[in-house]
């Protein structure tokens, strides 16, 4: 018969013959032969492949160093790789989480729109007319001015962005 | 550890029949194609057989062709070769050895078959 | 089938010494399935090399093979006592049958 060209899912071509790829979590050690099956060992510990594969050697787990601020939000195991994230207070600079940096704080006029997580950042949005923030928060969001119309108050002075109105009494009218 | 160990041989009249068996422990047997290889007292290497992993594929060398037949039980992680119509250019030490494609990396220590009258 | 012929028949050479085995196929050995064995006296033969040029498990590297198409060598370039044996070539490209060279004895000069 003539040697293939081509092979099936989860199959490799070397050598004119189809050999099976090593299943997730175990890598090459030797071809397969027209008698032999394909040789696969698994993955030693703190390694892994995630993938049908005909690697020589397994990857390394990531390593989430606390000096840069991380920490393991999920073990690897021999087909998934460690996933990191950030202590808390922190997030990640980038999509792959290989160093984290302090949450930004909303300041003074901003209010906190979405909390940050261990790997997004603070995001803050203006106070509109009516809020006000006096901090600066990673958490505070934009509190709504004082009512004084309901303590029975007159605005004395007007709140802005940064400060909140200030009520007083309403002046007595004398007879 | 991966072992192969050889039996069955011993003195045999020319025209009688020998089965020699190969034992495998230490690896997936049933992963393995398999070889017999022989040699003549003092003389080369020569192949004899080999067997798929699962015991559909069988080559011969033509010497031992129509004479010898390989098989396998991978249940029992066992290698045979019935050897019938034997000839005293048969004498040799007979080993088992394992399929890969790096070549027969694994042997057994052999065993001998002697064919005289 | 392939013939391989290995040269010379025998090897006479001190410890120390560097030593150069040849192995010669009749046509090409597709994708270099070519081996190397050792034999002792009363042993099993115990791979080498494979695919021409690759060391197998535990083999020191003091063996090295090389060579492609019809031409390859064994070198070992310091001979150690222990390495006074017998070398086969063999092919596992091209089957049936898997040919063997007649094999080298490297003895002590």
């Known amino acids: 018969p003539e040697p293939p060209t081509a092979c099936r899912e989860k199959q490799y071509l070397i050598n004119s013959q189809c050999c099976s790829l090593c299943q997730p979590g175990q890598k090459l050690v030797s071809d397969c032969t027209e008698f032999t099956e394909t040789e696969c060992l698994p993955c030693g510990e703190s390694e892994f492949l995630d993938t049908w594969n005909r690697e020589t050697h397994c990857h390394q787990h990531k390593y989430c160093d606390p000096n840069l601020g991380l920490r393991v939000q999920q073990k690897g195991t021999s087909e998934t790789d460690t996933i990191c994230t950030c202590e808390e207070g922190w997030h990640c600079t980038s999509e792959a989480c290989e160093s984290c940096v302090l949450h930004r704080s909303c300041s003074p006029g901003f209010g906190v729109k979405q909390i940050a997580t261990g790997v997004s950042d603070t995001i803050c949005e203006p106070c509109p007319v009516g809020f006000f923030s006096n901090v600066s928060s990673a958490f505070e969001k934009c509190h709504p001015w004082t009512s004084c119309e309901t303590k029975d108050l007159v605005v004395q002075q007007a709140g802005t962005n940064k400060t909140d109105v200030v009520c007083g009494p309403q002046d007595r009218l004398r007879a | 550890q991966v072992q192969l160990v050889e039996s069955g041989g011993g003195v045999v009249q020319p025209g009688r029949s020998l089965r020699l068996s190969c034992a495998a422990s230490?690896?997936?047997?049933?992963?393995?194609?398999m070889h017999w290889v022989r040699q003549a007292p003092g003389k080369c290497l020569e192949w004899v057989a080999v067997?798929?992993?699962?015991?559909?594929?069988?080559y011969y060398a033509d010497s031992v062709k129509g004479r010898f037949t390989i098989s396998r039980d991978n249940s029992k992680n066992t290698l045979y070769l019935q050897m019938n119509s034997l000839r005293a250019e048969d004498t040799a030490v007979y080993y088992c050895?394992?399929?890969?494609?790096?070549?027969?990396?694994?042997w057994g220590q052999g065993t001998m078959v002697t064919v005289s009258s | 089938e392939i013939v391989l012929t290995q040269s010379p028949g025998t090897l006479s050479l001190s410890p120390g010494e560097r030593a150069t085995l040849s192995c010669r196929a009749s046509q090409s050995v597709s994708y270099d399935y070519l081996a190397w064995y050792q034999q002792k006296p009363g042993q099993a033969p115990r791979l080498l090399i494979y695919g021409a040029s690759a060391r197998a498990n535990g083999i020191p590297d003091r063996f090295s093979g090389s060579g492609s198409g019809t031409d390859f060598t064994l070198t070992i370039s310091r001979l150690e006592p222990e390495d006074f044996a017998v070398y086969y070539c063999q092919q596992y490209a091209d089957y049936p049958p898997f040919t063997f060279g007649c094999g080298t004895k490297v003895e002590i000069k």
């Open positions: 067997i798929s992993y699962e015991g559909v594929k069988k």
């Open positions: 230490g690896f997936t047997f049933g992963s393995y194609g």
């Open positions: 050895a394992r399929d890969t494609s790096r070549g027969h990396d694994i």
